[in-house]
């Protein structure tokens, strides 16, 4: 089955610049299918923009000047690129790539969509580092004792833009765990968000990861915040310094835990 | 030009109570098109639910039922037993792929219908309240309460800032909430909750233990090498009524 990944969760540009949005196709040969691009402007219907067929033929929605959007495909990387020239306020939207998932009969195809990339236009000069800054909270002893469960909370602050995705996994597992989250909130010129995960007592001795996708993550990779395995019987440490783990970095955690 | 018009902008549904979404076609006969339904959830993920001719996306067949009412020129999507996972915006869309005539493989979308999910009416349940701390940050975790109306107060004389609470449906069909704040005196911050004309304090849930009975990281699992900005842990301390972890990048 065809699967679409849009690695850029958001793309922030200043007026008149060019935005390039990527869509990676897997499970199907890109040269054997058509890739479609749609946009959803705030408050408007999702609208088809442009498509590129297996033979490179481009089809464009009639209302859009031909040079506004350019679509391409790179078979070597199985990627389709939507280029938006001369970005302006009207281009603020979420852009989705899509393809018809091959099934035997033409009438039985289904169109699958990528997760979307939000185009953000800003006139602000942003600080050098507007990636999410994590703070982690470990389960309170009261919760683990009384409810035989523990809640991990992952707080992310001082990021821009506001588009962020958070999910949780156990170490050495790709299964996404059921978590809950608050709304993204504005704090001065940046944003904050938190997500929490409640696990049963038997899972407390496993390492958990809060995985954060954001446009401004270091090296463009998902940031992994490590929550250490918990034992419900002893010791604390003094939290003086901290660090988080980008995809290839390691992490040392420093903890102070007692009953709450 | 054809237009797909949802019956409602917002549809509140209760967990387990069937709900029906309708979408009418203006300017054309619905029988000339294939109808599709999609759901967009938090984070913009667009998931295929249903396409005419009894085609369902993975995991949707058991809980969703799509239909076309030719006479009324509208498409129908029934959610048979809604759960909190079904919250999102639902879109109808049409195409004529494989129908002959003008070959249009692009989808024409209608505006979304926002489906909000609320727990079923149920006996009132008092919340559990726990405090989690890290440096100046304090989180008040309020678990498994019903009904939704709640006031969460982080009690402190030295508030830096507070954020609006997040209130969500719990997996068991009640409510959970978290309120965050920053305080100079975080060690002494407690949480009190007004719910159902009663007050519940985080201190009601504190476990009286000796100093060796604390949550701690498993030592063998916490020995990763530090990067340059990290320092080795200081000596072990025993601090009462604190639950902290600091991490900055």
């Amino acid at each position: 089955a065809g699967h679409l990944e849009q690695p850029q969760i958001s793309s922030t540009k200043t007026l008149s610049k060019t935005a390039r949005l990527e869509c990676v196709v897997s499970g199907i040969t890109i040269s054997a299918t058509s890739v479609y691009w749609y946009r959803e402007r705030p408050g408007e219907v999702i609208q088809f923009l442009v498509s590129i067929s297996y033979d490179g033929t481009v089809r464009k929605e009639s209302g859009i000047p031909s040079g506004k959007f350019e679509v391409d495909r790179i078979p070597e990387t199985s990627t389709s690129t939507l280029t938006i020239h001369n970005v302006e306020k009207q281009d603020i939207a979420t852009y989705y790539c899509a393809l018809w998932e091959a099934q035997q009969e033409l009438g039985k195809k289904i169109k699958v969509f990528g997760p979307g990339t939000k185009l953000i236009i800003t006139d602000k000069q942003l600080d050098a580092d507007v990636s999410p800054k994590p703070t982690i909270f470990l389960p309170s002893i009261a919760e683990t004792k009384l409810q035989k469960a523990g809640t991990y909370l992952c707080l992310l602050e001082k990021f821009f833009p506001d588009v962020i995705k958070i999910h949780w996994q156990e170490k050495k597992s790709n299964t996404i765990l059921g978590s809950q989250e608050g709304n993204t909130m504005k704090t001065n010129d940046t944003y904050m968000k938190f997500s929490w995960l409640t696990v049963p007592e038997k899972s407390l001795d496993k390492e958990h990861r809060c995985i954060v996708r954001h446009e401004n993550n270091k090296n463009g990779v998902d940031q992994e915040i490590i929550f250490p395995p918990i034992k419900t019987d002893v010791i604390t440490m003094d939290p003086k310094d901290n660090c988080s783990k980008d995809a290839n970095d390691t992490l040392l955690l420093q903890l102070t835990n007692t009953s709450a | 030009a054809i237009e797909l018009v949802p019956e409602h902008q917002t549809v509140p549904v209760s967990i387990g109570v069937p709900a029906t979404l309708r979408c009418s076609m203006k300017g054309e006969a619905i029988g000339n098109y294939y109808i599709n339904w999609y759901r967009k959830t938090q984070g913009n993920t667009m998931t295929f639910i249903y396409r005419e001719k009894d085609i369902y996306g993975p995991g949707f067949k058991d809980n969703f039922q799509g239909d076309i009412d030719i006479a009324k020129n509208l498409a129908v999507l029934k959610i048979l037993a809604p759960s909190e996972r079904d919250e999102g915006s639902y879109y109808c869309a049409c195409d004529t792929l494989g129908m002959g005539g003008e070959y249009t493989d692009k989808l024409i979308f209608g505006k979304g219908t926002r489906v909000t999910v609320e727990p079923r009416s149920q006996p009132h349940t008092k919340p559990s309240v726990f405090v989690m701390k890290n440096g100046t940050n304090v989180a008040c975790l309020v678990k498994e309460f019903y009904p939704k109306d709640i006031r969460i107060n982080l009690v402190s004389s030295k508030k830096i800032t507070e954020f609006d609470p997040a209130i969500v449906i719990s997996p068991s069909g009640k409510y959970n909430a978290v309120k965050l704040g920053k305080y100079e005196d975080s060690n002494s911050v407690t949480c009190s909750v007004q719910h159902d004309n009663k007050t519940v304090h985080s201190t009601d849930f504190e476990v009286k233990t000796d100093s060796t009975d604390h949550v701690k990281p498993k030592e063998t699992e916490n020995t990763k090498q530090p990067s340059k900005s990290c320092h080795k842990p200081k000596a072990i301390v025993h601090t009462e009524k604190v639950n902290m972890m600091s991490l900055t990048v």
């Epitope: 490179g56 000047p65 009207q90 | -």
Partner: antibody, heavy 121, light 109 residues
Framework: EVQLVESGGGLVKPGGSLRLSCAAF????????MDWVRQAPGRGLEWVSS????????FYADSVKGRFTISRDNAKNSLYLQMNSLRAEDTAVYYC??????????????WGQGTMVTVSS | EIVMTQSPGTLSLSPGERATLSCRAS???????LAWYQQKPGQAPRLLIY???SRATGIPDRFSGSGSGTDFTLTISRLEPEDFAVYFC??????????FGQGTKVEIK
């Protein structure tokens, strides 16, 4: 049958103004982006300006930027080009054009017959 | 701005002969956005080829387009009397301006 008909051309002095119109027939005008392309006598084609279906996108060639204004009235199925501060080098046949078939990816498959603009003292 | 240069300026051929027209871009152009037009005296241009190699509706199959990157070619396999005209290439994909070549005139020898 889809048809584009230009009007409004004529003789004008340097520094003067002129407004060209393009009426569209047999087309759901409000769904299409529209363009102006000109051709000086004995010369090649030069793209002048482009406007989106709902006027949300407007582009100009550098040679006319600040002097020409493209606009449209979807209720009247009409496209306009307001030309101010005209120069001798603006003398040309002005065509309105559109990409009517979505298959063509933006190439101009429908053209008007053109209207002649002469800038001379 | 992408500059499109056509060669030759004029091509003198007889009916039945093969015509090869060249168009070179000053920088790489996606083949999906390269068009060829035919224009006869006193008439508006007519779209022949879009996407570098796809024929527009109603265009005879003696017209074919090829090329990629910066070099594109229009080939008329057997010239018919009605094919004697001026031919323009155009790139219409990158940010405006959408630029045309200066034209190649195909005349009867």
């Amino acid at each position: 049958e889809v048809q584009l008909v230009e009007s409004g051309g004529g003789l004008v002095k340097p520094g003067g103004s002129l407004r060209l119109s393009c009426a569209a027939f047999g087309i759901t005008f409000s769904s299409y982006s529209m363009d102006w392309v000109r051709q000086a006598p004995g010369r090649g084609l030069e793209w002048v300006s482009s406007i989106g279906s709902s006027s949300s996108y407007i582009f100009y060639a550098d040679s006319v930027k600040g002097r020409f204004t493209i606009s449209r009235d979807n209720a009247k199925n009409s496209l306009y080009l307001q030309m101010n501060s005209l120069r001798a080098e603006d003398t040309a046949v002005y065509y309105c054009a559109t990409s009517y078939s979505w298959n063509y990816g933006g190439a101009f498959d429908i053209w008007g017959q053109g209207t002649m603009v002469t800038v001379s003292s | 701005e992408i500059v499109m240069t056509q060669s030759p300026g004029t091509l003198s051929l007889s009916p039945g002969e093969r015509a090869t027209l060249s168009c070179r871009a000053s920088q790489s152009v996606s083949s999906s956005y390269l068009a060829w037009y035919q224009q006869k005296p006193g008439q508006a241009p007519r779209l022949l080829i879009y996407g570098a190699s796809s024929r527009a509706t109603g265009i005879p199959d003696r017209f074919s387009g090829s090329g990629s990157g910066t070099d594109f070619t229009l080939t008329i396999s057997r010239l018919e009397p009605e094919d004697f005209a001026v031919y323009f290439c155009q790139q219409y994909g990158s940010s405006p301006p959408y630029t045309f070549g200066q034209g190649t005139k195909v005349e009867i020898k």
